[in-house]
Interface confidence: low
Amino acid sequence: GWVWNQFFVPEEMNTTSHHVGRLRSDLDNGNNSFQYKLLGAGAGSTFIIDERTGDIYAIEKLDREERSLYILRAQVIDITTGRAVEPESEFVIKVSDINDNEPKFLDEPYEAIVPEMSPEGTLVIQVTASDADDPSSGNNARLLYSLLQGQPYFSVEPTTGVIRISSKMDRELQDEYWVIIQAKDMIGQPGALSGTTSVLIKLSDVNDNKPIFKESLYRLTVSESAPTGTSIGTIMAYDNDIGENAEMDYSIEEDDSQTFDIITNHETQEGIVILKKKVNFEHQNHYGIRAKVKNHHVDEQLMKYHTEASTTFIKIQVEDVDEP
């Protein structure tokens, strides 16, 4: 019968002819009366056989990632009779892996959004690289992830590619970060190949800033002839947050005379000082009122940022009008 061994050829072999192994019948006594033949896809082109000895050679470079095995057929003939000595038999030559493929991130580009001020350990995104080498062949496709850019704000789990927050970030200081992740095969050992990917991490706003008045004192004037409901001027606060977190409401904190009111222009986020009661120069020619400003929406957990409302003082001068 046939004497079989397993046949392996390392991929990317640079030798012009690489000895793969030998076909042998146990009836072959070595007197050169047998002729071995190789049939099937790759016979005569990729693989050749020494017909006298049964030695098989690979005569071209093989790429395991293109083709990982070859199914060939073996024949052995007795030259003196021209008859087959053994039944034709199928056998396999496996192409063994070398580390010739770098890890690739196939889902690029990566982008993630995470709330500012998220605590350490918050999961941001998972990046995954794939390696075309053989996962069952040593460490050729065993990957380790590392952070090339993004410290100290981010970290990556070496075996999973999960990116987490490692330090709190303030959107008002920087609203996006580019993180560069490297995946190295051979679990990072020398001779490893690697690939890199970039992850754009954007910080979404949380309401961690209260509105603050631009001025601590506003001076306005009102004519004694002005009817009630007249807008006598505007005041303005600023808020470092964005969107609805920057929406604010103005109100009167102190007005003993109850002469004025403040309404909020939600388009411009300005406070409009309104005359609530008519004024009389001869009766009172100036007023002092205090206004305050607060965010429109404040989350319960974020109340710590909004304890003291910002206030401003408004001095209002009444202008005299000649009366008939």
């Epitope: 640079n14 770098e102 090339l148 850019q149 580019w178 560069i180 020398p190 001779g191 490893a192 190949l193 690697s194 690939g195 890199t196 970039s198």
Partner: antibody, heavy 120, light 111 residues
Framework: QVQLVQSGAEVKKPGASVKVSCKAS????????MSWVRQAPGQGLEWMGI????????TYAQKFQGRVTMTGDTSTSTVYMELSSLRSEDTAVYYC?????????????WGQGTLVTVSS | QSVLTQPPSASGTPGQRVTISCSGS????????VNWYQQLPGTAPKLLIY???QRPSGVPDRFSGSKSGTSASLAISGLQSEDEADYYC???????????FGGGTKLTVLS
Amino acid sequence: QVQLVQSGAEVKKPGASVKVSCKASRYTFTSYYMSWVRQAPGQGLEWMGIIHPSGGDTTYAQKFQGRVTMTGDTSTSTVYMELSSLRSEDTAVYYCARGGIKLWLHFDYWGQGTLVTVSS
Amino acid sequence: QSVLTQPPSASGTPGQRVTISCSGSRSNIGSNFVNWYQQLPGTAPKLLIYTNNQRPSGVPDRFSGSKSGTSASLAISGLQSEDEADYYCAVYDDSLNGWVFGGGTKLTVLS
């Protein structure tokens, strides 16, 4: 065929800086590392550092740390090497050389070289 | 003083076989691929051998590379006058985290 075209020769005074450019074409610029190698007159090749144009991550030879800056512009497929605090011993031909997909893979294509002369 | 040691010069007559050695350490040749560059007078270096023994297309098979342990060598058989050039070995060094070149070998073809 891959092409790397470098900027022209420069003459600089000691203490000045020089910025050499290397424009790449006919390959995916962001997939390969780019190294800078210099050669002083009559001397051998000396590796200065490497940059990955897509992430901009760099590794510099210890000798040049603090004096060299390598940058890349993906919109023009160009890498730059700036060397500061020049001294006469920086007179050399500076080459850009395309690396592999990772640091330890060979440089397969080289620019034509840029002669930088440092003289007072 | 280069991290990789090459003989400063080598010579041979046309048709001869010449070998250029490159000696390093575990952190460079011992751990990584060796590459060889040819630099003809007045030109940029050209890749001759990569990953120890591979020839880029266009490089004649008279050039071959090998590596054993912490040493490597470049062999040129059937020497020709146009082979007169400087030859450099280069390898990535894991402990330096960077590339290192040999000092170069000037090959002279004697007529």
